[in-house]
Interface confidence: low
């Protein structure tokens, strides 16, 4: 029986060009976490495997950093990063737990100001 629950940072927002930490925490279970997958709408971002450590997807290696803990840091954010992110905890013997985070990347007011008054 799966007794655990996933706590996440929920709905979060960040400025374009900045960075954000995605965090999930599995509680209320004694199951062993064997692997955590971080995915964004069916794209694999990163994996933290209990045996093999962190692996970052080659397409994201320049903008994704492991940690803190089992979390994930997204850097150099763009508006295209807006959307749902999932932390998928593979555990033994419970099975799989999934948490959801919605990230909204906002245009920076400084960036807007700079672009509007940029001298050619």
């Amino acid at each position: 029986m799966m007794t655990g629950t996933i706590e996440t940072t929920g709905n979060i927002s960040a400025e374009k060009g900045g960075s954000i930490i995605l965090q999930c925490h599995l509680s209320s279970t004694t199951a062993q976490v064997t692997q955590v997958n971080w995915e964004q709408q069916d794209q694999l971002l990163a994996i933290c495997n209990a045996d093999l450590g962190w692996h970052i997807s080659p397409s994201f290696k320049d903008r994704v950093a492991p940690g803190p803990g089992l979390g994930l840091t997204l850097q150099s954010l763009t508006v295209n990063d807006t959307g749902e992110y999932f932390c998928i905890y593979h555990t033994y013997p419970d099975g799989t737990y999934t948490g959801r985070i919605f990230l909204e990347v906002l245009e920076s007011s400084v960036a807007e100001h700079g672009a509007r008054f940029q001298i050619p």
């Epitope: 062993q32 064997t34 692997q35 997958n37 069916d42 694999l44 994996i47 495997n49 209990a50 045996d51 093999l52 450590g53 692996h55 080659p58 593979h90 033994y92």
Partner: nanobody, 125 residues
Framework: EVQLVESGGGLVQPGGSLRLSCAAS????????MGWFRQAPGKGREGVSA???????TYSDSVKGRFTISRDNAKNTLYLQMNSLRPEDTAVYYC???????????????????WGQGTLVTVSS
């Protein structure tokens, strides 16, 4: 830390067979996929075969129908049965481990960051 040790390489005549083994140690949970790669003299490393979640397997076109990958979880060992060997199969064969992800069972080496030291297979008459 996971450690992989290959064995079973050697000299074999064309048309002959060999079975490579890869023993895994130092793991806690065993939740990972495994694959075989090879590197011929003067060439880059290429994927040969992988065994992924649910026991799914994949093979490169050059070995399909001749090589068979298998895994004995009780013995923590990966195998590669190589039949109908050809001179072009001559290479150092490496086994490698990668995280388990059900959406991916390809032979790209980019996810494989834990490697054995390799075992040499020479096919020659």
């Amino acid at each position: 830390e996971v450690q992989l040790v290959e064995s079973g390489g050697g000299l074999v005549q064309p048309g002959g067979s060999l079975r490579l083994s890869c023993a895994a140690s130092g793991y806690k949970y065993g939740v990972y996929s495994m694959g075989w790669f090879r590197q011929a003299p003067g060439k880059g490393r290429e994927g040969v075969s992988a065994i992924c979640s649910g026991g799914r397997t994949t093979y490169s076109d050059s070995v399909k129908g001749r090589f068979t990958i298998s895994r004995d979880n009780a013995k923590n060992t990966l195998y590669l049965q190589m039949n109908s060997l050809r001179p072009e199969d001559t290479a150092v064969y490496y086994c490698a481990a990668r995280p388990l992800w059900t959406g991916d069972c390809d032979l790209s080496s980019s996810w494989y960051k834990t490697w054995g030291q390799g075992t040499l297979v020479t096919v020659s008459s």
